[in-house]
């Protein structure tokens, strides 16, 4: 069987060779070939070439689409600004205002309190919280800011925490906490910031912000 296949391949190769040689002879205007024969062979050859070129274009398009699909790694970044809230909740509220960033719909600010991502990956997540407190007016407990994560089907968890003791300055002393780290997030995961006393948070321009970017 293998021998017969080999003979078949050689025959095809020979036919191709003869065909190419005939085209060459047509081109050089060899008189032994009739004009009709040459025209027929030429149009046949042009058809082949056209098919090859069309196939090449299609492949190129497919490849470029594959590349685009592979390169579909858009920048995902968000930076939101603190918003004073009448709510007594310890979760800080944020807004898309001032010099904010929301790169695309692969990250969203939900209910004004959490940044939710649609793509799995490593993210740098950060928060800066500025607060004004006084030792006498505050409880003994320090001011604590927590960066928290809620993944679908999982419990909430604390990713990062920072604590500052209250100032002795009057009426209150301003202090800033910065939290930041790299974490693996699943699709649908939400991150948010919690503080022990939201009433002490400073909402002046640039004081308190929250964001993330996909690495």
């Amino acid at each position: 069987h293998r021998r017969l296949d080999k003979i078949e391949d050689e025959r095809n190769l020979h036919e191709d060779f003869v065909f190419m040689k005939t085209i060459q002879r047509c081109n050089t205007g060899e008189r032994s070939l009739s004009l009709l024969n040459c025209e027929e062979i030429k149009s046949q050859f042009e058809g082949f070439v056209k098919d090859i070129m069309l196939n090449k274009e299609e492949t190129k398009k497919e490849n470029s689409f594959e590349m685009q699909k592979g390169d579909q790694n858009p920048q995902i970044a968000a930076h939101v600004i603190s918003e004073a809230s009448s709510k007594t909740t310890s979760v800080l509220q944020w807004a898309e205002k001032g010099y904010y960033t929301m790169s695309n719909n692969l990250v969203t600010l939900e209910n004004g309190k959490q940044l939710t991502v649609k793509r799995q990956g490593l993210y740098y997540i950060y928060a800066q919280v500025t607060f004004c407190s006084n030792r006498e007016a505050s409880s003994q407990a320090p001011f604590i800011a927590s960066l928290c994560l809620k993944s679908p089907g999982r419990f909430e968890r604390i990713l990062l925490r920072a604590a500052n003791t209250h100032s002795s300055a009057k009426p209150c002393g301003q202090q800033s906490i910065h939290l930041g780290g790299v974490f693996e997030l699943q699709p649908g995961a939400s991150v948010f910031v919690n503080v022990t006393d939201p009433s002490q948070v400073s909402h002046g321009t640039g004081f308190t912000s929250f964001g993330l970017l996909k690495l």
Epitope: I144, F155, I158
Partner: nanobody
């Protein structure tokens, strides 16, 4: 020694209320989430409610709107207020803690449990 002690269980009629308490000792509650679980006769232990150190709460669908979890860190105590009780709430209720940095059911300390019976 790290310990959790539940109290407040008992017999109650359908539609009635109970408040369970869980007294914690030997650790700082603000590093942990406190949770309530329950186990009905012949069934597996199931999640009821959970509270984070900063007060955020989570509930099983079956108890949402009827049960409320809370904590008093100054007293190192977690509570479970149970309203509109149903016969299917009958179970041994356990208090448990989980490290606040862990996001799955890894409760490393458990109480001995308190029995709640809902029956007329």
């Amino acid at each position: 020694e790290v310990q959790l002690v539940e109290s407040g269980g008992g017999l109650v009629q359908p539609g009635g209320s109970l408040r369970l308490s869980c007294a914690a000792s030997g650790f700082t509650p603000d590093d942990y989430a406190m949770g309530w679980f329950r186990q009905a006769p012949g069934k597996e232990r199931e999640f009821v409610a959970d509270i984070m150190p900063y007060g955020s709460t989570e509930y099983a669908d079956s108890v949402k709107g009827r049960f409320t979890i809370s904590a008093d860190n100054s007293k190192n105590t977690a509570y479970l207020q149970m309203n509109s009780l149903k016969p299917e709430d009958t179970a041994v209720y356990y208090c448990a803690r989980r490290d606040a940095g862990i996001d799955f059911y890894y409760m490393d300390v458990w109480g001995q449990g308190t029995l709640v019976t809902v029956s007329s």
